[in-house]
């Protein structure tokens, strides 16, 4: 058993049929010595008396808010949560496996630039009695500070018969050094509590590996005289690191119709303009990627050909 | 050429060669991003590699003030990786695929380090740690880690030279 926060404790249980469970001793936070009784949750049934209560925690029915009283007055609470371990593996029931970029990916994180600011998000089908708390650091043995905000519900989607909820959190490295080569990864830890179930999820990454620039901005077209060709120009996204002579992007320019199966014109360039062939009912799209490190491409920025 | 005395390097040549290094480093191990190598206890194996750190003057302001600190750091790293790529970690079993770009990568690291430091000038270089994995699978894992680390190192070096070519070239 360990303390998650004040008056909230996590009991780690090996979860299998007829498991013996864990013996837990609760102590009432009071100077009083006698006349103390214990109850669980809303029940008035007295579980025991005395300053300490010893319980065998085997299942969720044994978890909950234990309260010690004296003469009708509440003295203190202890909330017990369960953390299940099945076949040596901690349970991951609360969050959905996003399976990208690999199986058992519960947390996904992205950064728009090298400033040390990043966003992580996760998915669940649970809608109520759910809380998250996020901590982060650079490195684990001698951790350097990363400050994370509160996790918030950022999207709701319908997936078949189920509703899916997306939560996200923004974090900022306290002393970021955008130009340096990272040697220690960022660690992100998410504590998830659903009713009386506790789970924790972690992710470890370098900012450089989670970079995904915003799409290029201000796409403009200029038809070339006596030609099917069009000059398309754009600008670096506002959110990208500066100066651009140092933090350079490379671009992919594509002309395609509505369907992915349609024929296309495609060209890669390090410049902020390119000449392509425009077709009726097609769109010109441009996306960006770090020029020197193969992290994710941005989403496409598009303008119609006509 | 960047000599220890403080003259300017051939920024544009360095830019071209460092960009080539980036391409080669990714083609040497393109799928490395799909392996979570940190799960394999990174600390003891690749913590010894030289990293371009915050105080090394490789940021735009540091380059403007005095690019020599940064260039020396890059030079150290290039020599370090060049030696690693020529060591038994890469030459031993399992043999590299014949079409592996590691050979080209090795030559390009040497080429860029020579551009930065002509013969007759000597910046101190970092000792190569004795990384001699006994098992072929350990060697394979170490190669992945070294290449992964090299990708990050050459990305910073390429940014430095691109910025230098754009803003510091005579």
């Amino acid at each position: 058993i360990w303390e998650l926060k004040k008056d909230v404790y996590v009991v780690e249980l090996d979860w299998y049929p007829d498991a013996p469970g864990e013996m837990v001793v609760l102590t009432c936070d009071t100077p009083e010595e006698d006349g103390i009784t214990w109850t669980l949750d809303q029940s008035s049934e007295v579980l025991g008396s005395g300053k300490t209560l010893t319980i065998q925690v085997k299942e969720f029915g044994d978890a909950g808010q234990y309260t010690c009283h004296k003469g009708g007055e509440v003295l203190s609470h202890s909330l017990l949560l369960l953390h299940k371990k099945e076949d040596g593996i901690w349970s991951t029931d609360i969050l959905k496996d996003q399976k990208e970029p690999k199986n058992k990916t519960f947390l996904r994180c992205e950064a728009k630039n090298y400033s040390g600011r990043f966003t992580c998000w996760w998915l669940t089908t649970i809608s109520t009695d759910l809380t998250f708390s996020v901590k982060s650091s650079r490195g684990s043995s001698d951790p350097q500070g990363v400050t994370c905000g509160a996790a918030t519900l950022s999207a709701e989607r319908v997936r078949g018969d189920n509703k899916e909820y997306e939560y996200s959190v923004e974090c900022q490295e306290d002393s970021a050094c955008p130009a340096a080569e990272e040697s220690l990864p960022i660690e992100v830890m998410v504590d998830a509590v659903h009713k009386l179930k506790y789970e924790n999820y972690t992710s470890s990454f370098f900012i450089r590996d989670i970079i995904k620039p915003d799409p290029p901005k201000n796409l403009q077209l200029k038809p070339l005289k006596n030609s099917r060709q069009v000059e398309v120009s754009w600008e670096y996204p506002d959110t990208w690191s500066t100066p651009h002579s140092y933090f350079s992007l490379t671009f992919c320019v594509q002309v395609q119709g509505k369907s992915k199966r349609e024929k296309k014109d495609r060209v890669f360039t390090d410049k902020t303009s390119a000449t392509v062939i425009c077709r009726k009912n097609a769109s010109i799209s441009v996306r960006a990627q770090d020029r020197y490190y193969s992290s994710s491409w941005s989403e496409w920025a598009s303008v119609p050909c006509s | 050429r960047a000599v220890p005395g403080g003259s300017s390097p051939a920024w544009t040549q360095c830019q071209q060669l460092s960009q080539k290094l980036c391409t080669l480093a990714w083609s040497a191990h393109p799928l490395v991003g799909h392996m979570d190598l940190r799960e394999e206890g990174d600390e003891e194996t690749t913590n010894d590699v030289p990293h371009i750190q915050c105080g090394d003057g490789c940021d735009p302001q540091g380059l403007r003030d005095n690019s020599q600190f940064c260039l020396q750091r890059i030079h150290q790293g290039l020599i370090f990786y060049e030696k690693l790529l020529g060591s038994d970690i890469f030459t031993g079993e399992p043999s590299l695929l014949p079409d592996s770009p590691v050979g080209q990568l090795h030559a390009s690291l040497l080429g860029l380090s020579q551009l930065l430091q002509p013969e007759g000038h000597h910046w101190e270089t970092q000792q190569i740690p004795s990384l001699s994995p006994s098992q072929p699978w350990q060697r394979l894992l170490l190669r992945f880690k070294i290449l992964r680390s090299l990708q990050a190192f050459v990305a910073v070096a390429a940014r430095v030279f691109a910025h230098g070519a754009a803003t510091l070239s005579p």
Epitope: R228, E262, K263, K264, F268, R279 | S27
Partner: antibody, heavy 118, light 107 residues
Framework: QVQLVQSGAEVKKPGASVKVSCKAS????????LHWVRQAPGRGLEWMGW????????EHAPKFQGRVTMTTDTSTSTAYMELRSLRSDDTAVYYC???????????WGQGTMVTVSS | EIVMTQSPATLSVSPGERATLSCRAS??????LHWYQQKPGQAPRLLIY???QSTSGIPARFSGSGSGTEFTLTISSLQSEDFAVYYC?????????FGGGTKVEIK
């Protein structure tokens, strides 16, 4: 599978014109760009231009501007390349090729030898 | 127009050996570079597109790398059917242009 079959060899006199055909099969004709590339004997490859069978748009290499016409007949899934004012240095194998991507050449015809000789 | 230069013009290699073919562009073309193989009396065949992407059905011994102005086609272990002429082609801008070719012959 995608296939391009070209017309047979031609012998022409200088100053004459030649029209080479290229019949496509195995795909929807308007879904691919069609290019023409030629290769003089013992020499390298030279791009001549492309046509979009969907709308008849064309783009030619400046070298052939005014001397080449590329057309398509969607009813027969056939592309044509006509080269006028032939000279001896137009002697070459002429290839048509098709791709969904505009700028490189995935599927090639077998080639048509055009000999220009007096 | 962009001029593509291939080297060497002829490469003599023994079967089983590695062949490295070079292609240089007269200006930076990013990764807009494609490789073709042509055997005598046949049409060319696409091997690699956008510098390093392998065409389906092409043996894994063919690989491409490079960006900017310098590109390489590597054949890791030459088989008898690989002796042919290899062309690079840029697609950075029109007119599309080819290199002069490298003939890979049996040593």
């Amino acid at each position: 599978q995608v296939q391009l079959v070209q017309s047979g060899a031609e012998v022409k006199k200088p100053g004459a014109s030649v029209k080479v055909s290229c019949k496509a099969s195995g795909y929807t004709f308007t879904d691919y760009y069609l290019h023409w590339v030629r290769q003089a004997p013992g020499r390298g490859l030279e791009w001549m231009g492309w046509i979009d069978p969907e709308n008849g748009d064309t783009e030619h290499a400046p070298k052939f501007q005014g001397r080449v016409t590329m057309t398509t007949d969607t009813s027969t899934s056939t592309a044509y390349m006509e080269l006028r004012s032939l000279r001896s240095d137009d002697t070459a194998v002429y290839y048509c090729n098709a791709n969904k991507e505009l700028r490189y050449f995935d599927v090639w015809g077998q080639g048509t030898m055009v000999t220009v000789s007096s | 127009e962009i001029v593509m230069t291939q080297s060497p013009a002829t490469l003599s290699v023994s079967p089983g050996e590695r062949a490295t073919l070079s292609c240089r562009a007269s200006q930076s073309i990013s990764i807009n570079l494609h490789w073709y193989q042509q055997k005598p009396g046949q049409a060319p065949r696409l091997l690699i597109y956008f510098a390093s992407q392998s065409t389906s059905g092409i043996p894994a011994r063919f690989s491409g790398s490079g960006s900017g102005t310098e590109f390489t086609l590597t054949i890791s272990s030459l088989q008898s059917e690989d002796f042919a002429v290899y062309y690079c082609q840029q697609s950075n801008s029109f007119p599309l242009t080819f290199g002069g070719g490298t003939k890979v012959e049996i040593k």
